[in-house]
């Protein structure tokens, strides 16, 4: 189906609830080349058309993954299940390149935060990626939002260029990632 851009508090969203990327104030239907404008050119996977793309329509290709920036509000768990229904998982950040790409995308949505695939049971237990892999703070630091009133923010979201912990029940947008083999 045709994806139509609309203006919403200065942000770009798709009518079907997914955010692609801001394209130099161009609010028309994004083209393949305009998607490539939103990532580092040498890192973008070039495709010759929808049929040859390893990603579904409306997903952004970067290196060996497809990304969907969902603009429907959900808890962390609800966001995880939403990604599952799309055959993907909440974002797992594997490299500084990938982190830079993600920051570039979400920075065009300064009013919004996006769940990623990090959580923990409680503060005494280390952060864990959704696939069960360990989290290394060498890649990025998680800024805490913990207060006396809100002592256990055990899920993680990204807001502009900063990654925060947050209460898992707070409704937010999310980033789904689907890895593919080259």
């Amino acid at each position: 189906t045709m994806a139509i851009w609309r203006s919403n508090s200065g942000s770009n969203t798709l009518e079907n609830g997914y955010f692609l990327s801001r394209n130099k104030e161009n609010h028309s239907q994004p083209t393949q080349s305009s998607l490539e404008d939103s990532v580092t050119p040498t890192k973008a996977v070039k495709t010759t058309g929808v049929l040859s793309s390893p990603c579904p329509p409306n997903w952004i290709i970067y290196e060996k993954s497809c990304y969907l920036f969902s603009m429907s509000l959900n808890s962390w768990d609800g966001s995880k299940r939403q990604c599952w229904q799309l055959g993907s998982n909440l974002l797992k950040i594997d490299s500084s390149n990938e982190l830079g790409f993600i920051v570039k995308q979400v920075s065009s949505q300064p009013d919004n935060s996006f769940w990623i695939g990090l959580s923990r049971p409680q503060t005494e237990v280390p952060w864990l990626w959704e696939d069960g892999s360990t989290f290394s703070s060498n890649l990025f630091q998680i800024r805490t939002t913990a207060t006396q009133e809100n002592p256990s923010p055990n899920c993680v979201w990204i807001h502009v260029s900063v990654i925060y912990d947050q209460l898992c029940s707070v409704p937010s947008y999310s980033i789904c990632e689907k890895k593919f083999s080259m």
Epitope: D77, P121, Q122, E124, V125, L128, E130, D131, G132, S133, T134, S136
Partner: antibody, heavy 118, light 107 residues
Framework: QVQLVQSGAEVKKPGASVKVSCKAS????????MHWVRQAPGQGLEWMGW????????NYAQKFEGRITMTRDTSISTAYMELSRLRSDDTAVYYC???????????WGCGTLVTVSS | DIQMTQSPSSVSASVGDRVTITCRAS??????LAWYQQKPGKCPKLLIY???DLQSGVPSRFSGSGSGTDFTLTISSLQPEDFATYYC?????????FGPGTKVDIK
């Protein structure tokens, strides 16, 4: 596919030590916690602790603190669990298990029977 | 330590039966609970994690539910290969702990 291959059965005297190995393949060894779980004959499962193969940090169940050591050799993708000052009630099958989502144990080694007998 | 209890300790059932096993935690553990199946002489097999998420490759007749302190594993239609012992495990706090197990045997 993920595989965890453990070392063979051991018979030990009380007071001795045992070191069990667990060789991993089919995934990036340093990306996932490795847990050790034991099961005494006819009994249930008991979590002993984990090692983070990437950084080498460990977390032991307090019950075993002071006599358990978990190590790893990333060059050969192998995790080790050493238990010292063995007692007869340490007789059990010792499993290594790879961490999966939500701190579950999705992949298990075949187990190593350690018998402690005088 | 968080104590895990299971009931019943054993259940006799027939092929095709619906079997329900409950697990209770001594304190709230949110959804940080897993279920395992173990057959005699074999290593445990993960069935459910995160209280209700089905592990890849596990038949859909297995389902998990619950949050907080009370959890349930349901086998909707028992198959011959399902006769085994089932354990729950909490992953909320250290040390991780298992329930004592529920043995499902043939009636």
């Amino acid at each position: 596919q993920v595989q965890l291959v453990q070392s063979g059965a051991e018979v030990k005297k009380p007071g001795a030590s045992v070191k069990v190995s667990c060789k991993a393949s089919g995934y990036t060894f340093t990306d996932y916690y490795m847990h050790w779980v034991r099961q005494a004959p006819g009994q249930g499962l008991e979590w002993m602790g984990w090692i983070n193969p990437n950084e080498g940090d460990t977390n032991y169940a307090q019950k075993f603190e002071g006599r358990i050591t978990m190590t790893r050799d990333t060059s050969i993708s192998t995790a080790y669990m050493e238990l010292s000052r063995l007692r007869s009630d340490d007789t059990a099958v010792y499993y290594c298990a790879r961490n999966t989502g939500a701190y579950s144990f999705g992949y298990w080694g075949c187990g190593t029977l350690v018998t402690v007998s005088s | 330590d968080i104590q895990m209890t299971q009931s019943p300790s054993s259940v006799s059932a027939s092929v095709g039966d619906r079997v329900t096993i409950t697990c209770r935690a001594s304190q709230g553990i949110s959804s940080w609970l897993a279920w395992y199946q173990q057959k005699p002489g074999k290593c445990p097999k993960l069935l459910i994690y995160g209280a209700s998420d089905l592990q890849s490759g596990v038949p859909s007749r297995f389902s998990g539910s619950g949050s907080g302190t009370d959890f349930t594993l349901t086998i909707s239609s028992l198959q011959p290969e399902d006769f085994a012992t089932y354990y729950c495990q909490q992953a909320y706090g250290f040390p991780f702990t298992f329930g004592p197990g529920t043995k499902v045997d043939i009636k």
